[in-house]
């Protein structure tokens, strides 16, 4: 069973709840309040605030926090005020500001480019496999299989537009019905939300920042998962999306439009096409069972080709195989017919790094994956640093107020809907929900945008990406127009339905609460973030995929007990938090379960063993590099080795020091801190040599 957040020793308090966890308490835990008891006893203990049933985290032995971890941090301006500066100072300050803006835009540019290359890398590594997922014939009859294929393919190619376009071409070619395509589109919607979750992982260095960033990213995931959880069964039962979109497509006489404007691609393409260019048709061809495509490389070699349509004479087994009776003849021995063939002549090679290497797709993909993640991480760190230095004092106050403040009463409710429109508009401009939500993630992390405000922006982003798809569908050729438009509209109405489910009534904004809960767990146990990513985007879909291949009996046989257990646990938690007296004493808390089933602590100890060992090596390497760097530039203060390395050493010597957050996952000392032995510190460690 999956590891649970700490649930032991918790006394329900329905009036008040604590969504906090670890990381930035200003004071050390009060040891006097703790009772000396083992995990298995049911003796009365200190009351702590318990999260209501909808949350995913309630932690053991946590003191009540003075500060709400979800409150936005105050970014203090330590600099000299503008009015106190002399002319020279003002000019210098102005040019510094301009420089920072240029740097910010530069890093933002490379951040977006690295996302594009990351997508290409994923396509090179898993694109062909993704294409083969589509060639599974069971998709037609099994909506659940369609859903997980949509998730897996989009995760593998890091692009919902790629997976959607494959679906469109399959529907156009009658290899797939619109009915079978809808679950795949739902899955693609889920899959696309992995990108900003990966981006959030890059902010693992600072607990409070990571808490916000990860929650801000996963709010997208939870919205998509919850929407599918409700809307897929509804669609299977009623086919409402199929019916509505069919009526729309049939009632309008659409003429082929123009392509959706590529606004951001215009700027990023000149750079990204120098790195790598892909022939994305290969994935579609594999999906459509084209055997020849399986041996083709995704790396584009020839960019300028001349396509000549010509008629060639070909031999056929018999006259029955002729294209038409009048185009049939014999040479006396063999039957011949005339066939239209497209002859492709290569004229000019592409201008990108990998054009002459002739490396296998996997190798190119792996290289690009590593490089793009490094650039992504570097850019994100720099963006956060620049924003951190810019967004201080008055500037931060103005921006935060502008973004996070609601309209005056009675129009406060409209603010969220405006945010949805802004999110949709911005996504339409950048032509990618991944880019928009990924850019939003660090802003949530550093505390410029609240999760409550990021949520409607993300929902808007979901709508924005579908409007782009609708425009792209209108630009499709005649035969693909109907199917591509209907699928784009299915995507649109699915997101609209999701918004109607999880946004209008504040009480139903479950994704926010779930994301915050996950943010709390991940801030305390940072390895859990990676665990979550692997489980939700790979293991669960792959398991469902495997079970579906085994047959629906196996899927039901395994799925029904799992779903039953989940429902049982949720009901039990609901009763524990709302009306515990209804339950027998034993079921009023989770102490009847072994510790590993109700707490992440034992799991943390296991993970810490692995990461601790890895971290030791990493820190040694860091120190050697740092010292070499200092020797080279002949300056002992030019760079510092990672503070976390020093902490690691000190902690191992048994010294009681504040633990700084490392860039990698939690180490031994952090698991100690989780147990309350070491006070947590909120100061940010820069694990990069600056």
């Amino acid at each position: 069973m999956a590891p649970w957040p700490e649930l032991g020793d918790a006394q329900p308090n329905p009036d008040k709840y604590l969504e906090g966890a670890a990381g930035q308490q200003p004071t050390a835990p009060d040891k006097s309040k703790e009772t000396n008891k083992t995990d298995n006893t049911e003796a009365p203990v200190t009351k702590i605030e318990l999260l209501p049933s909808y949350s995913t985290a309630t932690l053991i032995d946590e003191p009540t926090e003075v500060d709400d971890p979800w409150n936005l941090p105050t970014l203090q301006d330590s600099g000299i005020k503008w009015s106190e500066r002399d002319t020279k100072g003002k000019i210098l300050c102005f040019f510094q500001g301009i420089g920072r803006l240029i740097l910010l835009l530069g890093f933002l540019y490379f951040f977006v480019c690295s996302l594009d290359i990351l997508s290409s890398a994923f396509q090179l590594v898993g694109g062909k496999m993704a294409g083969q997922f589509f060639s599974n014939s069971s998709i037609m009859s099994n909506p659940l299989l369609g859903l997980v294929i949509g998730v897996l393919v989009t995760v593998l190619v890091q692009s919902s537009s790629t997976s959607t376009s494959i679906v469109v071409s399959m529907v156009s070619s009658s290899l797939l019905t619109v009915r079978a395509a809808i679950p795949i589109i739902m899955g693609a919607n889920i899959g696309t939300s992995i990108t900003n979750t990966i981006v959030a992982l890059m902010q693992v260095g600072d607990r409070s920042e990571f808490r916000r960033a990860f929650a801000g990213a996963t709010v997208h995931d939870f919205f998509n998962w919850l929407s599918v959880l409700v809307l897929l069964p509804v669609e299977v039962a009623t086919h409402y999306l199929e019916i509505i979109t069919q009526l729309i497509v049939e009632s309008f006489h659409f003429k082929n439009g123009e392509d959706a404007p590529d606004l951001l691609k215009v700027i990023t393409k000149p750079f990204t096409k120098l790195i790598v260019q892909l022939d994305k048709k290969v994935i579609s061809q594999i999906a459509m069972n084209d055997e020849k495509a399986k041996n083709k490389s995704l790396v584009k070699i020839w960019c300028k080709t001349f396509t000549n349509k010509t008629q060639i004479n070909v031999t056929v087994p018999s006259t029955a195989n002729c294209t038409s009776p009048s185009l049939c003849w014999t040479d006396g021995i063999q039957n011949w017919t005339m066939k239209n063939v497209t002859y492709k002549e290569n004229i000019a090679k592409c201008q990108h790094i990998f054009v002459n290497f002739h490396l296998p797709d996997l190798a190119v993909g792996t290289i690009l994956l590593i490089l793009s993640l490094l650039v992504l991480c570097g850019c994100l760190i720099m963006i956060v640093k620049i924003l951190g230095s810019v967004l201080k004092g008055q500037v931060a106050t103005v921006i935060k107020k502008t973004i996070n403040t609601d309209f005056p009463f009675p129009f406060a409710w409209l603010t969220g809907y405006l945010a949805i429109l802004v999110g949709a508009g911005m996504t339409f401009i950048v032509q990618s929900s991944s880019v928009f939500t990924s850019a939003l993630t660090p802003l949530i992390g550093i505390g410029v945008i609240t999760i409550e405000r990021a949520y409607p922006l993300t929902l808007g982003s979901n709508i924005g990406t579908t409007t782009t798809a609708i425009l792209a569908a209108l630009a499709s050729p005649g035969n693909a127009l109907r199917s591509s438009l209907q699928i784009a509209l299915c995507h649109f109405f699915f997101n609209i339905s999701g918004i109607l489910l999880w946004y209008p009534i504040p009480f139903t904004r479950l994704p926010i609460r779930m994301a915050k809960g996950l943010g709390n767990i991940s801030a305390k146990y940072r390895w859990f973030a990676v665990f979550y990513l692997i489980i939700f985007f790979f293991l669960i879909p792959l398991t469902v995929f495997g079970l579906s291949l085994a047959g629906w009996r196996v899927l039901v046989g395994v799925g029904v007990p799992v779903v039953f257990i989940i429902i049982l646990v949720l009901c039990l938690r609901l009763l524990q938090s709302r009306c515990p007296r209804v339950l027998p004493k034993k079921l009023q808390n989770w102490n009847f379960l072994p510790l590993w089933m109700r707490s992440l602590k034992p799991w943390d100890a296991v993970v810490s063993k692995f990461t601790g060992c890895f971290q030791m090596r990493c820190c040694c390497c860091c120190r050697v590099c740092c010292r070499a760097c200092c020797l080279l530039c002949d300056c002992p203060k030019c760079c510092r080795c990672s503070k976390c390395c020093e902490d690691l050493e000190e902690a191992q010597e048994g010294q009681d020091v504040p633990v700084k957050a490392p860039e990698t996952f939690d180490n031994i000392t952090i698991s100690r801190e989780a147990q309350g032995e070491v006070p947590a510190s909120d100061s940010k460690t820069e694990c990069t040599a600056l």
């Epitope: 004479n313 006259t319 009776p325 009048s326 185009l327 049939c328 003849w329 014999t330 040479d331 006396g332 021995i333 063999q334 039957n335 011949w336």
Partner: antibody, heavy 119, light 107 residues
Framework: QVQLQQPGAELVKPGASVKMSCKTS????????MHWVKQTPGQGLEWIGA????????AYNQKFKGKATLTADKSSSTAYMQLSSLTSEASAVYYC????????????WGQGTSVIVSS | DIVMTQSHKFMSRSVGDRVRITCKAS??????VAWYQQKPGQSPKLLIY???TRHSGVPDRFTGSGSGTDFIFTISNVQSEDLADYFC?????????FGAGTKLELK
């Protein structure tokens, strides 16, 4: 230039068989079909069959199946037709003709072999 | 078998005249038709293939037309050396079949 050389005449007795040759030059023997055509004053031109010297594949007019056998010798670039169990009706001029690649038109013809079946 | 019918056994023309020789197929043969010229005591010589395409070295006064079942072979400006038998042949399907031939004579 393309040339197809055939012996001028063959005199055979009824019931016997004859093997006539068609020696080619001026092109790659194995790339084109070799057709055999019978011409009689009464019947006009009749297609007997064809052979593809490249792989030895043959096709026959149903009327001549069992009567004619087509073979080819790649080493000497020569095509052969054997006619068996000859009767007086087999008396005719037999042409070998090169087939154009990819269709059944015959672009170069031999001079023809006149077969006379007489006791 | 496909039967190729040449309606005229003999045609008489003067030098400089235009002559049209017709050929009718018993079923659709598309454009898989060839025309041959055979002078007395010689072997046939290919003039036209694919119903309209002139073979290399063939003077442009020889033209072919038609598709399906009806084909026409035209000599636009008859010369004395054109006196010969003209055969049509189909190669739409096996067995390949020839027309009975049309003998062009000088008036």
């Amino acid at each position: 230039q393309v040339q197809l050389q055939q012996p001028g005449a063959e005199l055979v007795k009824p019931g016997a068989s004859v093997k006539m040759s068609c020696k080619t030059s001026g092109y790659t023997f194995t790339t084109n079909n070799m057709h055999w055509v019978k011409q009689t004053p009464g019947q006009g031109l009749e297609w007997i069959g064809a052979i593809y010297p490249g792989n030895g594949a043959t096709a026959y007019n149903q009327k001549f199946k069992g009567k004619a056998t087509l073979t080819a010798d790649k080493s000497s670039s020569t095509a052969y037709m054997q006619l068996s169990s000859l009767t007086s009706e087999a008396s005719a001029v037999y042409y070998c003709a090169r087939g154009m690649y990819g269709h059944g038109a015959m672009d170069y013809w031999g001079q023809g072999t006149s077969v006379i079946v007489s006791s | 078998d496909i039967v190729m019918t040449q309606s005229h056994k003999f045609m008489s023309r003067s030098v400089g005249d235009r002559v049209r020789i017709t050929c009718k197929a018993s079923q659709d043969v598309g454009t898989a038709v060839a025309w041959y010229q055979q002078k007395p005591g010689q072997s046939p010589k290919l003039l036209i293939y694919w119903a309209t395409t002139r073979h290399s070295g063939v003077p442009d006064r020889f033209t072919g037309s038609g598709s399906g079942t009806d084909f026409i072979f035209t000599i636009s400006n008859v010369q004395s050396e054109d006196l010969a038998d003209y055969f049509c042949q189909q190669y739409s399907s096996n067995p390949l079949t020839f027309g009975a031939g049309t003998k062009l004579e000088l008036k």
